[in-house]
Interface confidence: low
């Protein structure tokens, strides 16, 4: 599984290169899945895709997604996550030229077809939870996450740092 | 076959509350939004609201918040949709639909409908 | 919300006709979807998320549009085609037009 130890590897590493600016830092090909290890699968439905969060069965292909880490240019106030103040972002992308997005005026996760550069709604703060878990904040919103909300992704707003593990926010990133 | 039978016919008076159920088979019931629609005499669709059954999660369109209730059966994979304070302008045929199983933008549409129960509200 | 806007409101056409009806949005979409109803009848999916046919929909049926603006056509009317047509969009919940009527001419 790729989760604390596997960021945490990433974190060193830009901790010693100090690498900043609009390219990706490493990228990394991942299936995403929840706290209760349901996938999060897409499906190409009329040049467009649908996100799902589901059960797969145990011969049933996970959906991969395309993880680019990015070095925040802007110092965080911020401890935890952070090298050096600097925050650790990712876009997601689980297939060519489509990226995850935050569509914050309907707290909804949206596919969107775009080009580079990709805008800020693109980008998610990496923090590196519990149980070899990671959780995506909004760039644009911070204290915003992506979350699961009965079948679907949503934006789910986090009140206080004791939310920051709550299930429903934290994600698992594997190999397999 | 996906399968959203609904209970019968109703008349009831000014005042009164109703409750239509809404039986579902040939899918996992817990998965997926259902949807509460009506459609008054000679007129077109009205969404009220929807319900997710896994967790009981409930949208009410703002029209009818404070009379709808929309609740589920999880052990008989059945829906339900009370209506209360009912005025004559409430009667119309009430159908249950459940969403396509996609969220995502512009995954709202309904694939598959009830087949409707008429609720006549008459002095 | 949005509000979606049909056109025409019925039509009459023959066996054989070419019918198309519109649905504006107020604004912008990413899909349109598309229910028949006959009278007395359940609302049935025709069409979703634009122009794909939903299971056992003949093709003489198609849809088309993007943005606020979207076209369901029936390219040659049949008999079991005379019925009331719906549009519907949106994003969190199903929002419907007002319905366009064929009739037999």
């Known amino acids: 599984a790729f989760g604390i130890s596997g960021v945490q590897k990433y974190t060193r590493a830009l901790h010693d290169s100090s690498i900043t600016g609009i390219s990706p830092i490493t990228e990394y090909l991942a299936s995403l899945s929840t706290y209760n290890d349901q996938s999060i699968t897409f499906a190409l439905e009329d040049e467009s895709y649908e996100i799902y969060v589901e059960d797969l069965k145990k011969d049933e292909k996970k959906d991969k997604v395309l993880l680019s880490y990015y070095e925040s240019q802007h110092p965080s106030n911020e401890s935890g996550d952070g090298v050096d103040g600097k925050m650790l972002m990712v876009t997601l992308s689980p297939t060519k030229d489509f990226w995850l997005h935050a569509n914050n005026k309907e707290h909804s996760v949206e596919l969107h077809k775009c080009e580079k550069p990709l805008p800020d709604q693109a980008f998610f703060v990496l923090h590196n939870m519990h149980s070899n878990c990671v959780s995506f904040e909004c760039k644009t919103d911070p204290g915003v996450f992506i979350g699961v909300k009965d079948n679907h992704l949503a934006l789910i707003k986090v009140d206080s740092s004791e939310n920051l593990c709550t299930e429903n926010i934290l994600f698992k990133l594997s190999e397999t | 076959e996906v399968q959203l039978v609904q209970s019968g016919a109703e008349v009831k008076k000014p005042g009164a509350s109703v409750k239509v159920s809404c039986k579902a088979s040939g899918f996992n019931f817990k998965n997926y939004w259902i949807q509460w629609v009506r459609q008054a005499p000679g007129q077109g669709l009205e969404w009220m609201g929807e319900?997710?059954?896994?967790?009981?999660?409930?949208y009410y369109s703002e029209k009818f918040k404070g009379r709808v209730t929309m609740t589920t059966d999880t052990s008989t994979s059945t829906a339900y949709m009370e209506l209360r304070s009912l005025r004559s302008d409430d009667t119309a045929v009430y159908y249950c639909?459940?969403?396509?199983?996609?969220?995502?933008?512009?995954?709202?549409?309904?694939?598959?409908w009830g087949q409707g129960t008429l609720v006549t509200v008459s002095s | 919300d949005i509000q979606l806007t049909q056109s025409p409101s019925s039509v009459s056409a023959s066996v054989g006709d070419r019918v198309t009806i519109t649905c504006s949005a107020t604004?912008?979409?990413?899909?349109m979807h598309w229910h028949q109803q006959k009278p007395g009848k359940a609302p049935k999916l025709l069409i979703y998320?634009?122009?794909n046919l939903a299971s056992g929909v003949p093709s003489r049926f198609s849809g088309s549009g993007s943005g606020t603006d979207y076209t369901l056509t029936i390219s040659s009317l049949q008999p079991e085609d005379f019925a009331t047509y719906y549009c519907?969009?949106?994003?969190?919940?199903?929002?419907f037009g007002g319905g366009t009527k064929v009739e037999i001419k």
């Open positions: 519907s969009g949106g994003y969190s919940h199903p929002t």
């Open positions: 319900i997710f059954p896994g967790t009981g999660t409930s």
């Open positions: 639909a459940r969403k396509h199983r996609g969220y995502g933008y512009g995954g709202a549409w309904i694939a598959y």
């Open positions: 604004s912008s979409v990413s899909s």
């Open positions: 998320r634009t122009s």
